[in-house]
């Protein structure tokens, strides 16, 4: 799942992995864009084991893997995007 | 050449335990996702664990978790299956695999010979 | 968890014969999807990953196709060394391997 949250909460990561994690082994990616308490983005992911990680946003494979889903949006995906308003 | 030697199958009764290992050479072992994976004697393959490049990260079947563990020893090339209260139907050959990844797909490339667990009484 | 149908289980052939096999994933794979072969006392040998890409060696006699949820595995012309059992494996959420065909000498 890749979801995209609006928060007025402040930074959720202590801190960031680059280490890769394969698609297969990822439950949900949650994106946290900065602002509104927080000055960076935050890329937090669940992962199969039910453990979480917060990833470097920078990181060229969660950004490759990112677009991948971006791309993907359209069909019904084992990884579906939600995107989650301002509430 | 890429290479993956288990070892440590045998025959043990119902409740007991017993340590695969796996030696890997010909490649730099900690750039690798590693797994292991078991065929019944005339059944499918079936995929039972798999662990990160450090060891960090674990991933189970759900058949086995809570009673199998998963590790490795980078320094050793070598991967390890640690398997408690083996049932009748842990019997199996148990494989050990490379997991090649670039994007999560290109998976699995390299595989040892197998090593056999019979759990009988 | 995602469930890999394989058919047919079994398939009898002679050389030169195309065949084909099929993966029904119950679930979108997309082309996440690898197919291996296994001669008996042997460990599996990859021949296609992500759906229709080649394993280096494997020759041009293999193919694969599909995407979503149906794959097919076709052999162009049987040869003598291609009777084994063939497996797919699908790597999009964790590892679900299908049941298995056995192609045998008809």
């Known amino acids: 799942v890749l979801e995209v949250y609006y928060t007025s909460l402040r930074c959720r990561c202590v801190q960031e992995s680059s280490v890769f994690i394969p698609r297969r082994f990822i439950d949900r990616i949650q994106i946290l864009p900065r602002g509104n308490g927080c000055p960076r983005k935050e890329i937090i992911v669940w992962k199969k084991n039910k453990s979480i990680v917060c990833v470097d946003p920078q990181a060229e494979w969660i950004q490759r893997m990112m677009e991948v889903l971006r791309k993907r949006s359209s069909s019904t995906l084992p990884v579906p995007v939600f995107k989650r308003k301002i509430p | 050449e890429v290479q993956l030697v288990e070892s440590g199958g045998g025959l043990v009764q119902p409740g007991g335990s017993l340590r695969l290992s796996c030696a890997a050479s010909?490649?730099?072992?900690?750039?690798?996702?590693m797994a292991w994976v078991r065929q019944a004697p005339g059944k499918g393959l079936e995929w039972v664990a798999s662990?990160?490049?450090?060891?960090?990260?674990?991933y189970y079947r759900d058949s086995v978790k809570g009673r199998f563990t998963i590790s490795r020893d980078n320094a050793k090339n070598s991967l390890y299956l640690q398997m408690n209260s083996l049932r009748a139907e842990d019997t199996a050959v148990y494989y050990c695999?490379?997991?090649?990844?670039?994007?999560?797909?290109?998976?699995?490339?390299?595989w040892g010979q197998g090593t056999l667990v019979t759990v009988s009484s | 968890d995602i469930q890999m149908t394989q058919s047919p289980s079994s398939l009898s052939a002679s050389v030169g014969d195309r065949v084909t096999i099929t993966c029904k994933a119950s679930q979108n794979i997309n082309k996440e999807l690898t197919w291996y072969q296994q001669k008996p006392g042997k460990a599996p040998k990859r021949l296609i990953y992500?759906?229709?890409i080649l394993q280096t060696g494997v020759p041009s006699r293999f193919s694969g196709s599909g995407s979503g949820t149906e794959f097919t595995l076709t052999i162009s012309s049987l040869q003598p060394e291609d009777f084994a059992t063939y497996f797919c494996?699908?790597?999009?959420?964790?590892?679900?391997f299908g049941q298995g065909t056995k192609l045998e000498i008809k």
């Open positions: 010909g490649f730099t072992f900690s750039d690798y996702y």
């Open positions: 992500n759906t229709n």
């Open positions: 494996l699908q790597q999009s959420s964790l590892y679900t």
């Open positions: 695999a490379r997991e090649e990844d670039y994007d999560g797909s290109y998976v699995m490339d390299a």
């Open positions: 662990i990160n490049y450090d060891g960090g990260d674990t």
